[in-house]
C-alpha cells in the first residue's frame, strides 16, 4: 500500500562553490516527496528541506557552522500525501550521500581582478577578496579569511602584442610585477589551493587589459 511506488534517491552529489553548498540527487519525484538530513560524523541528524518535491537542498547554513568538519547527508523518500508511511522494515527509504568536507572540497569560485595600477615599470594587481557565507562573530568571512595562506593566486600576464603568459604567485591578494615601459599588458588570475589533490584550481578570472577602465597609470 503506502510505499509500493516509493523509490530511494540515488546519485547524491555535493555541489559546492566558495562554501555555498547544495546536495543534489535523482530521480525527479513521481508521487513521492523527499526530506534531507545532515550530520557531522559525531553529531546528531538535522532535518532540512522537509517533504520537498525538489531534487536539491541547500545545506550551506549547516556546513558553514564548521567548514573543517566532515558531513554526511541522507535523503528520505516518502509517498506523496502519506508522509507517515514507512518502508517494509518500518523505516522510510533513504540513501546516504558521500562524505563531504567543505574546507577540502568546496570548489573555488571564479576570481575577479579588482584593480591594477601601474607606477613606472611596476604594476600592482589586486584580486577581489570574495565574501563567503561562513560567519565569525556575526560577520561574513572572505575567502582569504577562511583559507588564510592555504589559498594562493596565480597571475597570468602578457603583453597585448604577444601570446606567452608569464606567471606570478601570491599568498595575499596582491601582486607586484615588473613590466616593460610603454607596453600594454593583459591579466588573468586563478585561485589555487596547492595542498589539495582535488578541486585545486578555480576557473580563470575574466581577462583585464591595460588601457581599460579598471587600470590606473602613474609615472
Amino acid at each position: 500500500s503506502g510505499t509500493t511506488n516509493t523509490v530511494a534517491a540515488y546519485n547524491l552529489t555535493w555541489k559546492s562553490t566558495n562554501f555555498k553548498t547544495i546536495l543534489e540527487w535523482e530521480p525527479k519525484p513521481v508521487n513521492q516527496v523527499y526530506t534531507v538530513q545532515i550530520s557531522t560524523k559525531s553529531g546528531d541528524w538535522k532535518s532540512k528541506c522537509f517533504y520537498t518535491t525538489d531534487t536539491e537542498c541547500d545545506l550551506t547554513d549547516e556546513i558553514v557552522k564548521d567548514v573543517k568538519q566532515t558531513y554526511l547527508a541522507r535523503v528520505f523518500s516518502y509517498p506523496a500525501g502519506n508522509v507517515e508511511s514507512t518502508g517494509s522494515a518500518g523505516e522510510p527509504l533513504y540513501e546516504n550521500s558521500p562524505e563531504f568536507t567543505p574546507y577540502l572540497e568546496t570548489n573555488l569560485g571564479q576570481p575577479t581582478i579588482q584593480s591594477f595600477e601601474q607606477v613606472g615599470t611596476k604594476v600592482n594587481v589586486t584580486v577581489e577578496d570574495e565574501r563567503t557565507l561562513v560567519r565569525r562573530n556575526n560577520t561574513f568571512l572572505s575567502l582569504r579569511d577562511v583559507f588564510g595562506k592555504d589559498l594562493i593566486y596565480t597571475l597570468y600576464y602578457w603583453k597585448s602584442s604577444s601570446s606567452g603568459k608569464k606567471t606570478a604567485k601570491t599568498n595575499t591578494n596582491e601582486f607586484l610585477i615588473d613590466v616593460d615601459k610603454g607596453e600594454n599588458y593583459c591579466f588573468s588570475v586563478q585561485a589555487v589551493i596547492p595542498s589539495r589533490t582535488v578541486n585545486r584550481k578555480s576557473t580563470d578570472s575574466p581577462v583585464e587589459c591595460m588601457g581599460q577602465e579598471k587600470g590606473e597609470f602613474r609615472e
Epitope: 595562506k149 594562493i152 597570468y156 603568459k165 604567485k169 599568498n171 588573468s188 586563478q190
Partner: antibody
Framework: EVQLVESGGGLVQPGGSLRLSCAAS????????IHWVRQAPGKGLEWVGY????????YYADSVKGRLTISADTSKNTAYLQMNSLRAEDTAVYYC?????????????WGQGTLVTVSS | DIQMTQSPSSLSASVGDRVTITCRAS??????VAWYQQKPGKAPKLLIY???FLYSGVPSRFSGSRSGTDFTLTISSLQPEDFATYYC?????????FGQGTKVEIK
C-alpha cells in the same frame, strides 16, 4: 604513486621535427602546471617552457620560441613538446616536471628524461 | 630574466665533511629558491624549497638558508650517496632559471 614518463626521443636530422610525450599517472595534469626542462650532454639544466593544461596558457624560453610548442591532452593526461626546425644545439635530455603551483615549492616530480640527438 | 650565479662549479670533499654551495640571484626573488640534487643519468630530485624548507623524505643533513639575494645549500656531514651535482633554481618569476650547477666529487 605520482609518475611522469617521457617518450618520443631519438635521432633526428637538423631542420627535422620530433614530438615528445609526457604521460602522467597518479595525478591529474589539469590541476597542475607542466614544465619541460632540458640538459645538453655534460651541461646544466635549461628551462624550456610550461603549459597550464587547465587553460592552455604557455610560455617559452627565448632560445626555443617559435620552434618548440607545448600542448596537453587532459583526456590522455599527457603533455607534449612539439619540436620543429631542430638544430644541433637542441641535442639534450628532455625532462618534463610537475609544478604544484604553490608559493613555496617548484618542480616536485620529474620524469626520467628522453634523449633527443640532432645530427646529420 | 633573473640570473642565478652558483659557486663553486665543482668541489672535492670527503665523507663527513661540511659542504656549502652558494647561489646569488641577480635581483630579489624573495624566498622562491629551490635546490636539486642530480646523479649521472638520473632526473633532478628536489631537496630544498622556499629557500630553507626540507622537502619530504630528504635527510636532515641538508639545509638551506637565505640572506637577501644570496642562497646557501649546506650538507652538514657529507655521505657517500651525496656525491652528485647540485642546482639552485629561482621560481619567483617567469622564466624560472637555474644556477650552473656544482659538482661534488670525492677527494
Amino acid at each position: 604513486e605520482v609518475q611522469l614518463v617521457e617518450s618520443g626521443g631519438g635521432l633526428v636530422q637538423p631542420g627535422g621535427s620530433l614530438r615528445l610525450s609526457c604521460a602522467a599517472s597518479g595525478f591529474t595534469i589539469s590541476i597542475y602546471t607542466i614544465h619541460w626542462v632540458r640538459q645538453a650532454p655534460g651541461k646544466g639544466l635549461e628551462w624550456v617552457g610550461y603549459i597550464d593544461p587547465s587553460n592552455g596558457y604557455t610560455y617559452y624560453a627565448d632560445s626555443v620560441k617559435g620552434r618548440l610548442t607545448i600542448s596537453a591532452d587532459t583526456s590522455k593526461n599527457t603533455a607534449y613538446l612539439q619540436m620543429n626546425s631542430l638544430r644541433a644545439e637542441d641535442t639534450a635530455v628532455y625532462y618534463c616536471a610537475r609544478d604544484p603551483q604553490s608559493i613555496s615549492s617548484p618542480f616536485d616530480y620529474w620524469g626520467q628524461g628522453t634523449l633527443v640527438t640532432v645530427s646529420s | 630574466d633573473i640570473q642565478m650565479t652558483q659557486s663553486p662549479s665543482s668541489l672535492s670533499a670527503s665523507v663527513g665533511d661540511r659542504v656549502t654551495i652558494t647561489c646569488r640571484a641577480s635581483q630579489d626573488v624573495n624566498t622562491a629558491v629551490a635546490w636539486y640534487q642530480q646523479k649521472p643519468g638520473k632526473a633532478p630530485k628536489l631537496l630544498i624549497y622556499s629557500a630553507s624548507f626540507l622537502y619530504s623524505g630528504v635527510p636532515s643533513r641538508f639545509s638551506g638558508s637565505r640572506s637577501g639575494t644570496d642562497f646557501t645549500l649546506t650538507i652538514s656531514s657529507l655521505q657517500p650517496e651525496d656525491f652528485a651535482t647540485y642546482y639552485c633554481q629561482q621560481h619567483y618569476t617567469t622564466p624560472p632559471t637555474f644556477g650552473q650547477g656544482t659538482k661534488v666529487e670525492i677527494k
